[in-house]
C-alpha cells in the first residue's frame, strides 16, 4: 500500500487531523497524546491527565497535560472548584469577601485579590447592595443613626445631648420623651 | 526503559533470503507503529518499511516492494522483516525503530551482507 | 517522494560556536519534521521532534526551527560531544525520507 498526503482527512466523524503521516482520531478533554494513531483514520493513543493537571478541551497535539493552578492565599483566594482532569481549578473569594482585580481591564483570567466586604451594619447603614463581584453598598443610616461628616451617629438618648439640626430631622421626635 | 534488539543478520548469496528479528521490551509494543530502517556503509539513513500497532497496514520503500515482508507478533514483542531476492545493494544495517510521530527509540542493528 | 535536501554536508567548527544545519523538503511538510545525531557505529539518536520539540534528556543547546518547507538545526555552544553526522527526516508523508546528513567535526 502506499500513501498519500490529502489536505483534509477523509475519515468518517469529523474529530480526525493529521498528525505525523496518518488522519488520527484526537484525544478527549481530559486525556493526553501518548502516540499519534500508526494508520489512516486510526486512534491516538491517549491517557488520563495525572493528578493535579487537566485538558479542557478534545485535542490531537498536547503531549502533557496543565497544571492545575494554585489559588493565591497570599490574595486571599480560596478554591471554589477543584481542579478536575477536565478543569482547572477555579479560584475566587470566600463569603464575606470580593474580588478586586489587579488590572484596569478586568476580564477573567486577570490577576485579582479577595478583599473583605464592608460591613454596612458595623456602619450602622442600610444595605442596599450584597457584597460579591464588587464591595457591598450602603445606604442610608439605620434608624436610630444620623448622617454627620462621613458616618453614621447614634440619636442622643436624652435631651442633654446637642443635636444639630441634621440630628433634630431624623431624631427630633426622641426629644419629647 | 524502551529497548530494542535486532537479530537475524549474517552473509547471504544475491537472490537469497534472510529475516530479521526485533524484540521489543519496556513499552507497550501492540500501540506503537514500528519501521525498519537501514544505512548502507558509509552511507546515509534509508527508510525500508512500516507496519501499523495492529499489523493491518504495511508500506514498503519502492526499492524493496515486492521483495520484502514486514509483519509482527504483539503477543511476543517482535517485529520481523522477512528478506527475498536479496541484492547487493541491499547490504547496509538494519534497525528497527519505533514510531511516536518521529522514530524515538532505535535498536542497535544487526548487519546484512549480500556478496557472492 | 519528499526530497530532503541537507546543508551543508560537512562542517568544521570549534568548541564554543554556534552551529547551524539547514533542511530543505521539497514540498510543504508543515512541521512533521525530525533532527536526530547518529555517533559511528551506533544507532540514530532522536534530538528533536515536530520540527521544535527537543527530546526529554536532551541538553538545551540544541534546538529547532521552521515550518511548510524550510528548517534549521542549532547547537547553540558546540560540545566536543556533539561530535557526530545529523540528519534530519520529515514524516509528513509516506515514504518517510531523510536528509542525506551533516558531518560535523572539531576544527
Known amino acids: 500500500q502506499g500513501g498519500t498526503r490529502s489536505p483534509r482527512c477523509d475519515c468518517a466523524g469529523d474529530f480526525h487531523k493529521k498528525i505525523g503521516l496518518f488522519c488520527c482520531r484526537g484525544c478527549p478533554a481530559g486525556h493526553y497524546l501518548k502516540a499519534p494513531c500508526t494508520e489512516p483514520c486510526g486512534n491516538s493513543t491517549c491517557l488520563v491527565c495525572p493528578q493535579d493537571t487537566f485538558l479542557a478541551w478534545e485535542n490531537h497535539h498536547n503531549s502533557e497535560c496543565a497544571r492545575c493552578q494554585a489559588c493565591d492565599e497570599q490574595a486571599s483566594q480560596v478554591a471554589l472548584e477543584n481542579c478536575s482532569a477536565v478543569a482547572d481549578t477555579r479560584c475566587g473569594c470566600k463569603p464575606g469577601w470580593f474580588v478586586e482585580c489587579q488590572v484596569s481591564q478586568c476580564v477573567s483570567s486577570s490577576p485579582f485579590y479577595c478583599q473583605p466586604c464592608l460591613d454596612c451594619g458595623a456602619l450602622h447603614r442600610h444595605t442596599r447592595l450584597l457584597c460579591s463581584r464588587r464591595d457591598t453598598d450602603c445606604g442610608t443610616c439605620l434608624p436610630g443613626f444620623y448622617e454627620h461628616g462621613d458616618g453614621c451617629v447614634s440619636c442622643p438618648t436624652s435631651t442633654l445631648g446637642s443635636c444639630p439640626e441634621r440630628c433634630a430631622a431624623v431624631c427630633g421626635w426622641r426629644q419629647m420623651f | 526503559e524502551v529497548q530494542l534488539v535486532e537479530s537475524g543478520g549474517g552473509s547471504v548469496q544475491p537472490g537469497g533470503s534472510l529475516r530479521l528479528s526485533c524484540a521489543a521490551s519496556?513499552?507497550?509494543?501492540?500501540?506503537?507503529?514500528m519501521s525498519w530502517i537501514r544505512q548502507a556503509p558509509g552511507k546515509g539513513l534509508e527508510w525500508v518499511s512500516y507496519i501499523s500497532s495492529s499489523g493491518g497496514h504495511t508500506y514498503y520503500a519502492d526499492s524493496v516492494k515486492g521483495r520484502f515482508t514486514i509483519s509482527r507478533d504483539n503477543a511476543k514483542n517482535s517485529l520481523y522483516l522477512q528478506m527475498n531476492s536479496l541484492r547487493a545493494e541491499d547490504t547496509a544495517v538494519y534497525y528497527c525503530?519505533?514510531?511516536?510521530?518521529?522514530?524515538?527509540?532505535w535498536g542497535q542493528g544487526t548487519l546484512v551482507t549480500v556478496s557472492s | 517522494d519528499i526530497v530532503m535536501t541537507q546543508s551543508p554536508s560537512s562542517l568544521s567548527a570549534s568548541v564554543g560556536d554556534r552551529v547551524t544545519i539547514t533542511c530543505q523538503a521539497s514540498?510543504?511538510?508543515?512541521?512533521?519534521l525530525s533532527w536526530y545525531q547518529q555517533k559511528p557505529g551506533k544507532a540514530p539518536k532522536l534530538l528533536i521532534n515536530?520540527?521544535?520539540n527537543l527530546e526529554t534528556g536532551v541538553p538545551s543547546r540544541f534546538s529547532g526551527s521552521g515550518s511548510g518547507t524550510d528548517f534549521t538545526f542549532t547547537i547553540s555552544s558546540l560540545q566536543p560531544e556533539d561530535i557526530a553526522t545529523y540528519y534530519c527526516q520529515q514524516y509528513d508523508t509516506l515514504p518517510i525520507t531523510f536528509g542525506q546528513g551533516t558531518r560535523l567535526e572539531i576544527k
Open positions: 515536530d520540527a521544535s
Open positions: 514540498q510543504d511538510i508543515t512541521n512533521y
Open positions: 525503530a519505533r514510531y511516536s510521530g518521529a522514530f524515538d527509540h
Open positions: 519496556g513499552f507497550t509494543f501492540s500501540s506503537y507503529g
